[in-house]
Interface confidence: low
C-alpha cells in the first residue's frame, strides 16, 4: 500500500483480515472451512502436539538464518515424522558401530506412507538430539548407497555444549531418491571428520537413541527422542497444482512498533481465529501476528537530486527506483497449524503468513 | 504499481528513468555526476576490463543460485582482486605440495590496501580456475592457522568436466579475520576429502597456476589466471553510512516479454546511459535492461470464496493476502559499472538494478 491520502485504518485491517480468510482456505485448497462434526472430544493427542512443536521449532530456527524456499511452497505442506528403526533391529548387526561412526536406518515403507510420490516432498530433515559435548567435534553425514558404499552428504562443526541440542540436516534429495527406489531399509552414517593427515578421529558426540541399557519409562522417553526424519510434503490431493518459483527474504521490524511512523512501515495486526474470522476449526495456534504493510513511499523526482539530502532518501523511499513505489512485505515467515479433517488431526505449514518487515518497492 | 486505470506508459517509463538517475547517484553517494576532466585518453586498462568481466561473471553465476545479501549492500561495492603469491615464493617451500593438497598464499598488505578496515568488507571469494577433470573429486578447503595447523572451511563435490571452470569459495569471514590480524602472509589449502576408512585419496583436480615449466607469453596468461581473491567492499569514504538489514531474492521472467499480459508483469525497458540520461561518465556498460513492473493486482473479496475458482486466484493475484496488493519486483539483479574518479578507473557493483520478475505483494 502506498498513498498519501488519509487512510481508514479500520478498512485496511478489515480487508487484510478478509484476504487472510481467503488465503488460508486457498493454501489448504478448501472451498469452505472443514466441518467439525467428527472431531473427537478432549485436547489434541500428544503425538500431534509434539509434531506441531517440531514444526514450530523449525520455523524459529530458520528465522535467524532462513533457507531459500521454492514458491511452490505457497501451498500448505503436510508435516510428518518417521522415527529411526530401533537399534535392536538386525540391520544394525551388519554395520559395526566403530569408534568413528554411528548408523541410522529408516523403513522406507513408512516414508512412502507419509509421502506417496517423490515429487510431493518439499523438505526432509534428519533430526538428531545430541547430548552434551565436551570438545568441538567436526562430523560428516553419509548416505547408504549399497552395503559397503557410502556417499558423503554434508558436514557440521559442533561446538562444545553443556546442554542437549537438536541437530538438523537437510536430506531432501536423499529421501526423494529413496522414495523413487524399491529398497526396504535405507540409512545414514554419522562419522567423525578425518583429514588425509590426521586419521585417528573418534566420534565424541553422543546422539540420543544409541546409549544402551535403559529400561522402563526412561527408555520410552529416550526412544521418542531417537533420530527421526521430519518430512514436509504436498498432500496427494493437492499434487496437480504444483508450480515453482522462488521467494525473497530479509530482516527488520522493531522500529515500526515503537514509533508512529507515517511512512511505509509494518503495522501490528493480530488475527484471533475465533474473534476475527469466526473460525473454531483451527485448533493450534489460537491466532497469530499476521501484521501488514502500510504507509506512503514518496516518489522522489531526481530534478531535485543535486541535493545530497534528497539522494539519501532513495534508500528508504524508493530503493528500486520504481515509477510508483509501493509499501510491501520484505520478510515473511511461515505458520504451522493443526486442524481436523473428519476425525483426523493434521499438522500443516502455511508459507509466507507473518509479515516481519516491509519495504518500499 | 497496481492500478486498473488506463496507464500512460510513456509517463511511467519517464518516471522510471528519472528514478534510476537518482538511484545510481544515490548508490554511489554522488550529489552529481563526477567531473570527466581528468580522464586519460584511450580505452580502459586491460586490468580494469578483466576486473569488470570477473564481476559480470560473478553476477551470471549468482542468478542461478543467488546468495543472501545484506541490504547495507544497497550502496555500491568497490570490486578489487588480489592475486595469489606466485609459487616460486619461498613461503611455498615450507609446505610440501603433497599428493592430496595444494597451497595458496596471499599477501595481507595487498588485502589491506584494497580494504583498509575489516568492517568495510562485504564479500570475499576465493576464485580458482580448475582445468579439465576426468573423475568426480570431493575437495576440502582449509584456512592456515599457524605453520602446522589448518582449520576446515568448506567442501565441494566436483563433477567430471572436459572444459576448464572457475570455482568460487565464500571466504568473507576468513579475509575479515586476516584484515584484523597483523600477519604478513596468510593462506588456504585445497585437499582431497579423506574419510576415516579410505585415506589414500589423491587430489586429482588440476588448478591453474600450479603447472610448472611454462615460458613467455603462455606463462603470463597462466599467471593472470592463477588463484585470486575477489573482494567487494564499501569504499572508506562511504563507511559512515553503513547500516544493516537483509534483502529478498527470487526467480522468473520469460513469460512477460512474450505475452500481452494486462495484469502485473515485468515490462521491458533498456536504459542507454548517453541517450536516456545524458551521461557519458559511465564507461562500461553503455546501458542495461533495467525493466520495470506494471499491471493490476486485483484484490479478491473472500465473500466470493465459496467458489474454489476464486480461491485459486489468490496465488497469482494476492499470495500475501494484502489489503491492497501491488505489482513489485521479485527477482532483482545487480549491475557492475566502470567509471572514473579523477584519473582513477573504478569498478563498482550496484545492487538490485535489473528487474527480472515481478509479483503481486
Amino acid at each position: 500500500l502506498s498513498t498519501s491520502k488519509t487512510i481508514d485504518m479500520e478498512l485496511v485491517k478489515r480487508k487484510r483480515i478478509e484476504a487472510i480468510r481467503g488465503q488460508i482456505l486457498s493454501k489448504l485448497r478448501l472451498a469452505s472451512p472443514p466441518s467439525q462434526g467428527e472431531v473427537p472430544p478432549g485436547p489434541l493427542p500428544e503425538a500431534v502436539l509434539a509434531l506441531y512443536n517440531s514444526t514450530r521449532d523449525r520455523v524459529a530456527g530458520e528465522s535467524a538464518e532462513p533457507e531459500p524456499e521454492p514458491e511452490a511452497d505457497y501451498y500448505a505442506k503436510e508435516v510428518t515424522r518417521v522415527l529411526m528403526v530401533e537399534t535392536h533391529n538386525e540391520i544394525y548387526d551388519k554395520f559395526k558401530q566403530s569408534t568413528h561412526s554411528i548408523y541410522m536406518f529408516f523403513n522406507t515403507s513408512e516414508l512412502r506412507e507419509a509421502v506417496p510420490e517423490p515429487v510431493l516432498l518439499s523438505r526432509a530433515e534428519l533430526r538428531l538430539l545430541r547430548l552434551k559435548l565436551k570438545v568441538e567435534q567436526h562430523v560428516e553425514l553419509y548416505q547408504k548407497y549399497s552395503n559397503n558404499s557410502w556417499r558423503y552428504l554434508s558436514n557440521r562443526l559442533l561446538a562444545p555444549s553443556d546442554s542437549p541440542e537438536w541437530l538438523s540436516f537437510d536430506v531432501t534429495g536423499v529421501v526423494r531418491q529413496w522414495l523413487s527406489r524399491g529398497g526396504e531399509i535405507e540409512g545414514f552414517r554419522l562419522s567423525a571428520h578425518c583429514s588425509c593427515d590426521s586419521r585417528d578421529n573418534t566420534l565424541q558426540v553422543d546422539i540420543n537413541g544409541f546409549t544402551t541399557g535403559r529400561r522402563g519409562d526412561l527408555a520410552t522417553i529416550h526412544g521418542m527422542n531417537r533420530p527421526f526424519l521430519l518430512l514436509m510434503a504436498t498432500p496427494l490431493e493437492r499434487a496437480q497444482h504444483l508450480q515453482s518459483s522462488r521467494h525473497r527474504r530479509a530482516l527488520d521490524t522493531n522500529y515500526c512498533f515503537s514509533s508512529t511512523e507515517k511512512n511505509c512501515c509494518v503495522r501490528q495486526l493480530y488475527i484471533d481465529f475465533r474473534k476475527d474470522l469466526g473460525w473454531k476449526w483451527i485448533h493450534e495456534p489460537k491466532g497469530y501476528h499476521a501484521n501488514f504493510c502500510l504507509g506512503p513511499c514518496p516518489y522522489i523526482w531526481s530534478l531535485d537530486t543535486q541535493y545530497s539530502k534528497v539522494l539519501a532518501l532513495y534508500n528508504q523511499h524508493n530503493p528500486g527506483a520504481s515509477a510508483a513505489p509501493c509499501c510491501v512485505p520484505q520478510a515473511l515467515e511461515p505458520l504451522p497449524i493443526v486442524y481436523y479433517v473428519g476425525r483426523k488431526p493434521k499438522v500443516e505449514q502455511l508459507s509466507n503468513m507473518i509479515v516481519r518487515s516491509c519495504k518500499c518497492s | 504499481l497496481s492500478t486498473s486505470k488506463t496507464i500512460d506508459m510513456e509517463l511511467v517509463k519517464r518516471k522510471r528513468i528519472e528514478a534510476i538517475r537518482g538511484q545510481i547517484l544515490s548508490k554511489l553517494r554522488l550529489a552529481s555526476p563526477p567531473s570527466q576532466g581528468e580522464v586519460p585518453p584511450g580505452p580502459l586498462p586491460e586490468a580494469v576490463l578483466a576486473l569488470y568481466n570477473s564481476t559480470r561473471d560473478r553476477v551470471a553465476g549468482e542468478s542461478a543460485e543467488p546468495e543472501p545479501e545484506p541490504e547495507a549492500d544497497y550502496y555500491a561495492k568497490e570490486v578489487t582482486r588480489v592475486l595469489m603469491v606466485e609459487t616460486h615464493n619461498e613461503i611455498y617451500d615450507k609446505f610440501k605440495q603433497s599428493t592430496h593438497s595444494i597451497y595458496m598464499f596471499f599477501n595481507t598488505s595487498e588485502l589491506r590496501e584494497a580494504v583498509p578496515e575489516p568492517v568495510l568488507l562485504s564479500r570475499a571469494e576465493l576464485r580458482l580456475l580448475r582445468l579439465k577433470l576426468k573423475v568426480e573429486q570431493h575437495v576440502e578447503l582449509y584456512q592456515k592457522y599457524s605453520n602446522n595447523s589448518w582449520r576446515y572451511l568448506s567442501n565441494r563435490l566436483l563433477a567430471p568436466s572436459d572444459s576448464p571452470e572457475w570455482l568460487s569459495f565464500d571466504v568473507t569471514g576468513v579475509v575479515r579475520q586476516w584484515l584484523s590480524r597483523g600477519g604478513e602472509i596468510e593462506g588456504f589449502r585445497l585437499s582431497a576429502h579423506c574419510s576415516c576408512d579410505s585415506r589414500d585419496n589423491t587430489l586429482q583436480v588440476d588448478i591453474n597456476g600450479f603447472t610448472t615449466g611454462r615460458r613467455g607469453d603462455l606463462a603470463t596468461i597462466h599467471g593472470m589466471n592463477r588463484p585470486f581473491l575477489l573482494l567487494m567492499a564499501t569504499p572508506l569514504e562511504r563507511a559512515q553510512h553503513l547500516q544493516s538489514s537483509r534483502h529478498r531474492r527470487a526467480l522468473d521472467t520469460n513469460y512477460c516479454f512474450s505475452s500481452t499480459e494486462k495484469n502485473c508483469c515485468v515490462r521491458q525497458l533498456y536504459i542507454d546511459f548517453r541517450k536516456d540520461l545524458g551521461w557519458k561518465w559511465i564507461h562500461e556498460p553503455k546501458g542495461y535492461h533495467a525493466n520495470f513492473c506494471l499491471g493490476p493486482c486485483p484484490y479478491i473479496w473472500s465473500l466470493d470464496t465459496q467458489y474454489s475458482k476464486v480461491l485459486a486466484l489468490y496465488n497469482q493475484h494476492n499470495p500475501g493476502a494484502s489489503a491492497a496488493p501491488c505489482c513489485v519486483p521479485q527477482a532483482l539483479e545487480p549491475l557492475p559499472i566502470v567509471y572514473y574518479v579523477g584519473r582513477k578507473p573504478k569498478v563498482e557493483q550496484l545492487s538490485n538494478m535489473i528487474v527480472r520478475s515481478c509479483k503481486c505483494s
Epitope: 485504518m9 485491517k13 512498533f257 514509533s259 508512529t260 493480530y270 | -
Partner: antibody
Framework: EVQLLESGGGLVQPGGSLRLSCAAS????????MSWVRQAPGKGLEWVSA????????YYADSVKGRFTISRDNSKNTLYLQMNSLRAEDTAVYYC??????????????WGRGTLVTVSS | DIQMTQSPSSLSASVGDRVTITCRAS??????LNWYQQKPGKAPKLLIY???SLQSGVPSRFSGSGSGTDFTLTISSLQPEDFATYYC?????????FGGGTKLEIK
C-alpha cells in the same frame, strides 16, 4: 529498580521558559518510546508529547505544537521537555511516562511521580 | 482528533459491587484502547491495554472489553483499594487522547 524521576518544575511567568528532565533507570532506555502527559489541578489527563526510542520521530498535541520541544539523550538515560512561550493554561503536574509499544498500542506502562509547573505573574 | 467520552463522570458504589465504566470513541479505534487508574496525589497506573489485555500485576477482577467505538472496564467485585479515578486512552492515532475520567467513590 525500574523508575522515572522528573525534575525542573517550578514557578514561571507567562511567556517564560522552563526545561523539564526525566531520569530513567532500571531498563534499556533507548528501547522505549517516551512521553509527557500533564494534569491541570483538579482536571483530567492530557497527552502532551512523545518521542521514539532513537529520538528520530516526535509527536505533539496541537495545544503545545511550536512552543514545546521533546528530546532525549540516550547516553544519559534522560528525557527532556523544553517549554517556551508558557501560558497560564500550561499550569499542571507534568508526568514522564514510558511507552510500551509492543503491538503498536502505545500504552503508558511506567509513570514518574510528576513535577508541578505553575505559570503565573 | 479522536474524542474519548467516558461515562459516568462519577459513580458511587460499595465494596463487593460489580462496576462497569464505559468509554466511547468518536470514530472506530479497533482495540487501540487502554485503561488507567489514578489515586489522589499519585501517578496513573496501567490496568488494561489493547482493550482487553490485563497488564501484569493487575488483579484479575479488572477486565476490559469492546472494539471499534464502544469499550467497557469492569471491576467484578469492588475492593476498598479500587476507589479512584479511571481514565481510558486511545492509541489509534496521534494526538493520543484520554477520556475525561470516571471518579469511583464509596457509597
Amino acid at each position: 529498580e525500574v523508575q522515572l524521576l522528573e525534575s525542573g518544575g517550578g514557578l514561571v511567568q507567562p511567556g517564560g521558559s522552563l526545561r523539564l528532565s526525566c531520569a530513567a533507570s532500571g531498563f534499556t532506555f533507548s528501547s522505549y518510546a517516551m512521553s509527557w502527559v500533564r494534569q491541570a489541578p483538579g482536571k483530567g489527563l492530557e497527552w502532551v508529547s512523545a518521542i521514539s526510542g532513537s529520538g528520530g520521530s516526535t509527536y505533539y498535541a496541537d495545544s503545545v505544537k511550536g512552543r514545546f520541544t521533546i528530546s532525549r539523550d540516550n547516553s544519559k538515560n534522560t528525557l527532556y521537555l523544553q517549554m517556551n512561550s508558557l501560558r497560564a493554561e500550561d499550569t499542571a503536574v507534568y508526568y514522564c511516562a514510558r511507552v510500551d509499544s509492543s503491538g503498536g498500542y502505545w500504552y503508558f506502562d511506567l509513570w514518574g511521580r510528576g513535577t508541578l509547573v505553575t505559570v503565573s505573574s | 482528533d479522536i474524542q474519548m467520552t467516558q461515562s459516568p463522570s462519577s459513580l458511587s458504589a460499595s465494596v463487593g459491587d460489580r462496576v462497569t465504566i464505559t468509554c466511547r470513541a468518536s470514530q472506530s479505534i479497533s482495540s487501540y484502547l487502554n485503561w488507567y487508574q489514578q489515586k489522589p496525589g499519585k501517578a496513573p497506573k496501567l490496568l488494561i491495554y489493547a482493550a482487553s489485555s490485563l497488564q501484569s500485576g493487575v488483579p484479575s477482577r479488572f477486565s476490559g472489553s469492546g472494539s471499534g467505538t464502544d469499550f467497557t472496564l469492569t471491576i467484578s467485585s469492588l475492593q476498598p483499594e479500587d476507589f479512584a479515578t479511571y481514565y481510558c486512552q486511545q492509541s489509534y492515532s496521534t494526538p493520543l487522547t484520554f477520556g475525561g475520567g470516571t471518579k469511583l467513590e464509596i457509597k
